[in-house]
């Protein structure tokens, strides 16, 4: 295992319909074909998987049906988007690369976003 | 275990008020936020509302705005459904429910219920 | 406001049927939406959760699918406990909206 670096914006405010966007960038040593993906969010001391998706290279990032989490990618940066956030889900979202193929394997673990996601005030059919 | 604890059946005159608790235990409380659905006798469900027992914001159906107020009490793990103006039509069981944050592990929405609070309306 | 149509509005079918409720949402919601089933009487019932995802105790003959706009809960061999009105629901964010309702009967 190879470690690698990974950078990702160190703050991002969700919108009022709860998504967060942010940019999760790696320095690839070589050339991987075979790239997976995986945010995990840190809050009080406890850390979770989100989401993850495996992906060839130049291909879309495929994420299950049901997943809360979208992307695209563009050589060494992958766009994740999460959506259906409230405020519970403030905390530290966390980048983590891993390059499958071909060998030698790698990864790579960001420094995490803290996403902020705000509980709107009643007002008409406003987004939660 | 999980249970969700609502008070007992409420009779009301037109223009009145009713409050309807629901006591939560067997989970922390100030984790998972709380809505409040609404049955009319025959009727389907109809959300009208959502409260975040954490911080205490909620959130209301259009329609209920001015009339409902959703409010929480941390020391007791209960929340509180206020609806105001009362007319015959709002004549029905009440229901809470709790919704847990989208990125906790094996969190379902809307996963436990309480027993409903009937609430009628008559003059 | 964001409406969610079922249909049937009510069906009857046979005891090992498989039975099919639509739920069609006015607008994209990627895969955020619940079904419930609710017998005569009793509070209504988490049986799929976010389109696909099995409620932990509900039994194996039911399925959800779909994303967007389009959703469907599937039940594959119909048993007389699922006498019932189901109910879809959109969980993106407020307002968290109900379908009208699909009412099942056995014949």
């Known amino acids: 295992c190879k470690a690698m670096h990974v950078a990702q914006p160190a703050v991002v405010l969700a919108s009022s319909r709860g998504i967060a966007s942010f940019v999760c960038e790696y320095a690839s040593p070589g050339k991987a074909t075979e790239v997976r993906v995986t945010v995990l969010r840190q809050a009080d001391s406890q850390v979770t998987e989100v989401c993850a998706a495996t992906y060839m290279m130049g291909n879309e990032l495929t994420f299950l049906d049901d997943s809360i989490c979208t992307g695209t990618s563009s050589g060494n940066q992958v766009n994740l988007t999460i959506q259906g956030l409230r405020a519970m889900d403030t905390g530290l979202y966390i980048c983590k690369v891993e390059l499958m193929y071909p060998p030698p394997y790698y990864l790579g673990i960001g420094n995490g976003t803290q996403i902020y996601v705000i509980d709107p005030e009643p007002c008409p059919d406003s987004d939660f | 275990q999980v249970q969700l604890v609502q008070s007992g059946a409420e009779v009301q005159k037109p223009g009145a008020s009713v409050k309807v608790s629901c006591k939560a235990s067997g989970y922390t409380f100030t984790s998972y936020y709380m809505h409040w659905v609404r049955q009319a006798p025959g009727q389907g469900l109809e959300w009208m509302g959502i409260?975040?027992?954490?911080?205490?914001?909620?959130n209301y159906a259009q329609k209920f705005l001015g009339r409902v107020t959703m409010t929480r009490d941390t020391s007791t793990s209960t929340v509180y459904m206020e609806l105001s103006g009362l007319r015959s039509e709002d004549t029905a069981v009440y229901y809470c429910a709790r919704d847990p944050p989208i990125t906790m592990v094996r969190g379902a929405p809307f996963d436990y219920w309480g027993q409903g609070t009937l609430v009628t309306v008559s003059s | 406001d964001i409406q969610l149509t079922q249909s049937p509005s009510s069906l009857s079918a046979s005891v090992g049927d498989r039975v099919t409720i639509t739920c069609r949402v006015s607008?994209?919601?990627?895969?955020?939406l619940n079904w419930y089933r609710q017998k005569p009487g009793d509070v209504p019932e988490l049986l799929i959760y976010r389109s696909s995802n099995f409620q932990s105790g509900v039994p194996s003959r039911f399925s959800g699918s779909g994303s967007g706009t389009d959703f469907t809960l599937t039940i594959s061999s119909l048993q007389p406990e699922d006498v019932a009105t189901y109910y879809c629901q959109r969980t993106y964010n407020a307002p968290y909206t109900f379908g009208q309702g699909t009412k099942l009967e056995i014949k």
């Open positions: 607008q994209d919601i990627s895969s955020f």
């Open positions: 409260i975040n027992p954490s911080g205490g914001s909620s």
